[in-house]
């Protein structure tokens, strides 16, 4: 008796595909050992056809795969383009050799069944319509025409030319003739359901001279398309329902035992479990639309169905399309926090993962908006200028080659709370979602800039200092000049950091920036920040106004811009954003959204294209020199 379990008999038709699931006992060894599918020969030897080690036999090339789902203790063998030669005895099993734990599977592939030559077969999907063609001889032209459905004993009328209609076909069946052709009539049945499947007879005339035709109507539930996605990646359901439902509301639902629960529809309904990580996008006027879900979770696996109906809900007899989604926990996408916490006035540094093989791809950051069908307008990108309302407080730092780029948002307000997406114009699986939560600040910020009334005088020397707590002592401090193409890190040397220091005076830690001489181009937003290697931490922003010298005073009143210049995170969040061990502010690719929407995101980015390297240290130059001084008092 084998502890492996699966289907003992699998029967299919030539040209179709099979998906065989084998279940194994829940042990660590089983989860990680080799999985195989082999064919038993007459000698009793079992020849490997495919294994989880990457082996694929010649006869399975391009038409089979084997996927392990360790979280479910299952593995799945998918075989497409079946032929009768695939009929035989197989084993699915575990172990380094094919003599390990296994289960016997018998696969039978039959020819497509033939019907008597006088039977016309119509094969239609659920929800579609069929037009049955019924030829007759000219002498039966004046006679009654009818279509009936065969039951065990009799043939039950569906519709006839005297306008009699079976109650279950009212509003769905039409009998008509085309033009002047008096040798054929047609019956159209719409909104097909499984109950409509069966044998029909169309007839013109009565008695022995009547014209009869046998019809076999097959109504198929669409075969689920199998989708295999990694944990934390994204999936797009491309739904093509046809022109006849182009004007109906569209939906995506997930089978939940007896019902199909709507996840999202075009009437504004959205399941709270998918908040911030889903979009539905109408593609065109032909009834095509797509639904994108990102930040896939283990519990997202299941049977999905898309459809169209004015109610935005599943309805029998309306076209559908189905998918079986598998979520593989052996994911290439790094596990990061999906929630980032900040405080009002503070800042967050969000590390966005991307496929390291696509380091030259364009990086974007957009804000998910749930209104309507949902959309995600780009706020910043490697070649997309920062949106105006984020002036001075948002920048994207690309770190080519290491699979991460960082987005920093400071001067936080409670309005900034919500869902944001990291995406690139490359591998769409790597789109990730971050939920930003913003709490009211309860303490002083960690980074503080003085003077806060930052007005520099043209031609003079102007110094601003950034005070930081001792816990940032060992970290790299930087100043950067913000522009809508990024925040250009200014050349610096941190003198104090080179001096050995046993104690740290909480009141005296500062890094200064000096503009000498001040020029008009120096006006703008400056950020003071801390980082450790490529891991960015807290920032604070200050607006420096530049004015000409006025008689009597070299300083003028502070600008309004600095009302929001003091920024910081809660202390524990600062720790985590810098510390290698506890990357609390490095988010997990949480929830997400849709293919066409991402296309829009891309289009928007094209519109916003600007010269220069957004967020890179060498993308721009400064007219004034600046130094970082680390003062000890």
């Amino acid at each position: 008796k084998s502890p492996i379990f699966g289907p003992q008999e699998v029967s299919s038709i030539e040209g179709d595909s099979v998906s065989i699931t084998c279940y194994y006992p829940d042990t660590s060894v089983n989860r990680h050992t080799r999985k195989y599918w082999c064919r038993q020969g007459a000698s009793g030897m079992c020849t490997t056809l495919i294994s989880s080690n990457g082996y694929l036999s010649k006869e399975y090339s391009g038409r089979a795969n084997l996927i392990n789902f360790p979280e479910n203790n299952t593995f799945v063998i998918n075989i497409e383009q079946l032929t009768q030669d695939d009929t035989g005895s197989y084993k699915c099993g575990l172990g380094t050799s094919n003599r390990g734990l296994s289960f016997d599977v018998s696969l039978e592939v039959s020819q497509v069944p033939e019907l008597p030559s006088d039977t016309h077969v119509y094969t239609k999907d659920i929800g579609r319509n069929v037009t049955i063609e019924c030829p007759f001889k000219r002498e039966n032209a004046p006679s009654k025409k009818s279509l009936c459905k065969k039951t065990n004993q009799s043939c039950e009328l569906v519709i006839d030319s005297t306008e009699k209609v079976n109650p279950s076909y009212i509003g769905r069946a039409k009998l008509f003739m085309k033009g002047t052709d008096l040798t054929v009539f047609y019956v159209n049945i719409s909104h097909l359901t499984h109950n409509d499947a069966g044998l029909y007879i169309c007839q013109a005339g009565e008695g022995p001279s009547a014209d009869k035709k046998n019809v076999d109507l097959q109504v198929l539930a669409p075969e689920p398309e199998l989708l295999y996605k990694d944990l934390r990646s994204s999936v797009t359901f491309e739904c093509d329902l046809g022109r006849e439902v182009a004007n109906e509301a569209k939906y995506l639902c997930r089978m939940n035992k007896e019902t199909c629960d709507v996840i999202i529809n075009t009437l504004g309904k959205r399941d709270p479990d998918f908040e911030g990580r889903i979009l539905i996008t109408p593609k065109d006027d032909n009834g095509r639309f797509s639904v994108l879900i990102t930040g896939l979770r283990k519990e997202d696996a299941g049977h999905y169905q898309c459809g169209a109906h004015s109610s935005g809900l599943p309805q029998e007899g309306w076209p559908i399309q189905t998918w079986q989604l598998f979520v593989n926990e052996e994911s290439t996408i790094p596990n990061r926090r999906s929630v980032v916490k900040g405080v009002t006035g503070g800042s967050v540094a969000i590390a966005c993962p991307y496929n390291p093989k696509e380091s030259s791809s364009l990086k974007y950051w957009c804000r998910w908006e749930g209104d309507g069908n949902g959309h995600c307008p780009v706020l910043v990108g490697t070649q997309a200028q920062v949106q105006e309302e984020y002036e001075g407080r948002l920048a994207l730092f690309d770190q080519p080659g290491n699979g991460t780029y960082t987005v920093i948002l400071n001067q936080l307000t409670t309005e900034d709370a919500g869902f944001y997406w990291c995406l690139t114009n490359g591998d769409s699986r790597w789109r990730t979602t971050i939920e930003l939560q913003v709490a009211e600040a309860t303490r002083e910020p960690n980074l503080e800039v003085t003077p806060q009334n930052a007005t520099a005088v043209l031609g003079e020397t102007f110094t601003v200092s950034c005070h930081y707590p001792c816990k940032f002592y060992s970290q790299e401090k930087y100043w950067c000049k913000w522009s809508n193409k990024g925040c250009h890190i200014l050349p610096s040397h941190d003198e104090g950091a080179r001096q050995s220091s046993v104690s740290c005076d909480q009141s005296s830690q500062l890094v200064s920036m000096t503009l000498n001489p001040v020029s008009k181009e120096d006006e703008g937003w400056y950020w003071c920040g801390v980082k450790q290697g490529q891991t960015y931490g807290e920032t604070t922003a200050i607006y420096i106004a530049v004015e000409e010298r006025t008689r009597g005073s070299s300083h003028v009143n502070p600008t309004d811009a600095n009302a929001r210049a003091k920024v910081a995170l809660e202390e524990e969040v600062v720790d985590s954003s810098i510390s290698e061990k506890e990357n609390k502010a490095i988010p997990n690719p949480g929830p997400f959204a849709n293919e066409r929407e991402i296309q829009n995101v891309g289009d928007q980015a094209q519109e916003n294209r600007a010269s220069g390297d957004a967020g890179s240290a060498d993308g721009q130059s400064r007219s004034s020199s600046s130094k970082h001084h680390h003062h000890h008092h």
Epitope: F5, P7, Q8, E9, V10, S11, S12, I13, D16, S17, V18, S19, I20, T21, Y23, H194, L220, A221, E223, P224, M255, K257, E258, T259, G302, H303, E316, Q324
Partner: nanobody, 127 residues
Framework: QVQLVESGGGLVQPGGSLRLSCVAS????????MAWFAQAPGKEREFVAA??????????YYADSVKGRFTVSGDNAKKTLDLQMKDLKPEDTALYFC??????????????????WGQGTQVTVSS
Amino acid sequence: QVQLVESGGGLVQPGGSLRLSCVASGLPFSSSRMAWFAQAPGKEREFVAAIGWRGRTSYKYYADSVKGRFTVSGDNAKKTLDLQMKDLKPEDTALYFCAAHPNDDGDPRISGNYQYWGQGTQVTVSS
């Protein structure tokens, strides 16, 4: 209203045969998996056999204890399920339940993976 109705149960001698049938009505889907479970007095419900459909492909599953003796068959479109039982043994005595589920995923041996259940038909194997 959803109904699964089993029939064909009865009293049979060891070594004898029986054919159980189940008809589902009112299901909101063309069932993608149907199964037979047996519950002997004072015992848990146990998996006997199942059939799953995906398109034109069918998958038949059996418990080790019935392999070679029982044959499951069914019609997805008609929502019917049959169990041909041969070489019956006294330990096959139980109440046999028919179960249905909208899709063919999850372990077919686990009763919690089925949404709809019939009332059961009694099979007694005794001399």
